[in-house]
């Protein structure tokens, strides 16, 4: 129905008021819901109304505005403090102390975050995004620099339906369509063998407490586990000779031990230095990610930071010690 210049939508009635003609919805059931367009941002809940704009938003703090579009900083929030002396003594000892596992304590000086003291260093959101890993979407953290809000804005809860089967058949050069989904790691790219690779810039350099032979034996599971966290696919980089770049890692105390061995090299029966783990160089292949998602890592910097964030949360399933993003083609260094 219409009244004068005002055009009313389906199910609405025209009412003449003191301030002129207005549209009114006598029964919200019969009218187009203003909530249909999901106007409420940042997790606000939408309630249909009888008058324009036919919805009202109930905003979750710290947001306000008719569409919860405004961020309001809480009044003078005191900065989080660190258990100063206790944590100063514990920082950078190579073991994560939960009492110091906070942004204010640089995640125990990097001990809880794969040696990365600030995974959110490039995040310019007004929100402290490290505090918003909360199983709900926080759009202000949903950027690559803010680590995609830990993938909480795109159905993070989706799990691989045939997980055991898909794990057993991951990256086995046979396409299993039941595993060819983001949550199942796109079957390790088995179904995209004919597509061109789409490599992110840079290399992830990871130290893991598994000797090279064990890591290579378990490579498919390892790549699947990390790929699941990063919502993309990973592969072990090859050197100029085509060899997989997985090298023995001799641990943090290696410099002193090497020095000691140099002076005693000629002694008979000298044992070789013990391997503490592996240093593995990984590449990100986004060929499937870019088809299914706009949350793909264009370079390895944020991917490394996201792994550090998982270390902070304690959600890594492998004994990772450190992660670094290398921009240039690395020389083989130990």
């Amino acid at each position: 129905s219409s009244c004068g210049q005002v055009k009313c939508r389906k199910g609405e009635q025209c009412v003449h008021t003191a301030s002129g003609p207005r549209c009114f919805c006598p029964s919200p059931r019969d009218c187009e819901s203003g909530c249909a367009s999901s106007p409420c941002q940042h997790g606000g809940s939408c309630h249909p109304q009888r008058q324009p704009p036919y919805y009202s938003c109930q905003c979750a703090p710290p947001f306000s505005g008719s569409r919860c579009e405004l961020y309001t900083a809480p009044p003078s929030t005191p900065p989080a403090t660190c258990l100063s002396q206790y944590c100063a003594d514990k920082a950078r000892d190579g073991v994560c102390d939960e009492a110091c596992n906070s942004h204010a304590c640089q995640w125990d000086g990097g001990d809880c975050s794969l040696t990365m003291e600030n995974p959110w260093a490039n995040c310019s959101s007004p929100l402290p995004c490290w505090d918003y890993i909360n199983n709900q979407c926080d759009e202000l953290c949903n950027t690559v620099e803010c680590l995609f809000d830990n993938f909480e804005c795109q159905g993070n809860s989706k799990t691989c339906k045939y997980d055991k089967y898909c794990a057993d058949h991951f990256k086995d050069n046979h396409c299993d369509q039941g595993c060819n989904s983001e949550e199942c790691g796109w079957d390790g790219l088995d179904c995209a063998a004919d597509q061109p690779e789409n490599l992110a810039e840079g290399t992830l350099v990871i130290v893991v407490l598994m000797p090279p032979e064990q890591l290579l034996q378990d490579a498919r599971s390892f790549l699947r586990a990390l790929g699941t966290l990063l919502h993309t696919n990973l592969r072990i980089k090859r050197d100029s000779q085509g060899e997989l770049m997985v090298y023995p890692y001799y641990g943090e105390k290696s410099a002193a031990m090497k020095k000691q061995r140099m002076t005693r090299r000629s002694l008979p029966g000298e044992q070789e230095q013990e391997v503490a783990g592996s240093k593995v160089f990984l590449e990100i292949d986004n060929r499937q990610c870019v088809q299914d998602s706009d949350h793909c890592f264009k370079n390895t910097d944020a991917a490394a930071a996201l792994l550090a964030s998982h270390a902070i949360q304690g959600t890594l399933s492998y004994p990772l010690v450190s992660v670094v993003s290398e921009s240039l083609t690395p020389e083989r260094t130990q």
């Epitope: 190579g94 073991v95 943090e252 783990g277």
Partner: antibody, heavy 122, light 107 residues
Framework: EVQLVESGGGLVQPGGSLRLSCAAS????????MSWVRQAPGKGLEWVSY????????YYADSVKGRFTISADTSKNTAYLQMNSLRAEDTAVYYC???????????????WGQGTLVTVSS | DIQMTQSPSSLSASVGDRVTITCRAS??????LAWYQQKPGKAPKLLIY???IRASGVPSRFSGSGSGTDFTLTISSLQPEDFATYYC?????????FGQGTKVEIK
């Protein structure tokens, strides 16, 4: 199967020394922290010391600081507790226990050895 | 150091009873609390970690709850093999400290 076996306990005079060993098997030794926990006869549990074999980080209870030294040999998958200047109040069953989280000191102890008795008496 | 106080220090119960043991920390330990069961002459056994997560192989009659300073271990239906001493332990701030123990005896 993950297993811890302690050895080295015995009778020692006050002021004496003893070295306890904890042989680990069934898991990657360097990836998990290890603690020593003791229990005096008829008493409760008391945490003594912790080591993370990979980094060599060590922690001690105040009651043993300066007298006890924890160490680990990753080539032998064994943790040690060197106990010096022993006192009568150190008499207890000593257990070694593995921490459940990789590199996380703040994790529960999920595997325990059978214990070894240390008696300090003249 | 953080003090852990368990109550009661002992209790008598019958098979099938519901048993509740409480543990209070002198300051917040968030959810970094474990419960252990110990039988005479044996090593402790981990039952619950992170305040409420059952360790592998632990029967579902054991449950844990709480966070901050107040925690509870509940045995929903006591079985003959559950008669033992139970300890809580905080592993938030070192030195890690145990409660004094709660002995569950047969009535």
């Amino acid at each position: 199967e993950v297993q811890l076996v302690e050895s080295g306990g015995g009778l020692v005079q006050p002021g004496g020394s003893l070295r306890l060993s904890c042989a680990a098997s069934g898991y990657t030794f360097s990836s998990y922290g290890m603690s020593w926990v003791r229990q005096a006869p008829g008493k409760g549990l008391e945490w003594v010391s912790y080591i993370y074999p990979y980094s060599g980080a060590t922690y001690y209870a105040d009651s043993v600081k300066g007298r006890f030294t924890i160490s680990a040999d990753t080539s032998k998958n064994t943790a040690y507790l060197q106990m010096n200047s022993l006192r009568a109040e150190d008499t207890a069953v000593y257990y070694c226990a593995r921490h459940s989280g990789y590199y996380r000191i703040s994790s529960a102890m999920d595997v325990w050895g059978q214990g070894t008795l240390v008696t300090v008496s003249s | 150091d953080i003090q852990m106080t368990q109550s009661p220090s002992s209790l008598s119960a019958s098979v099938g009873d519901r048993v509740t043991i409480t543990c209070r920390a002198s300051q917040s330990v968030r959810s970094f609390l474990a419960w252990y069961q110990q039988k005479p002459g044996k090593a402790p056994k981990l039952l619950i970690y992170r305040a409420s997560i059952r360790a592998s192989g632990v029967p579902s009659r054991f449950s844990g709850s709480g966070s901050g300073t107040d925690f509870t271990l509940t045995i929903s239906s006591l079985q003959p093999e559950d008669f033992a001493t139970y300890y809580c332990q905080q592993y938030y701030i070192s030195p890690w400290t145990f409660g004094q123990g709660t002995k569950v005896e047969i009535k």
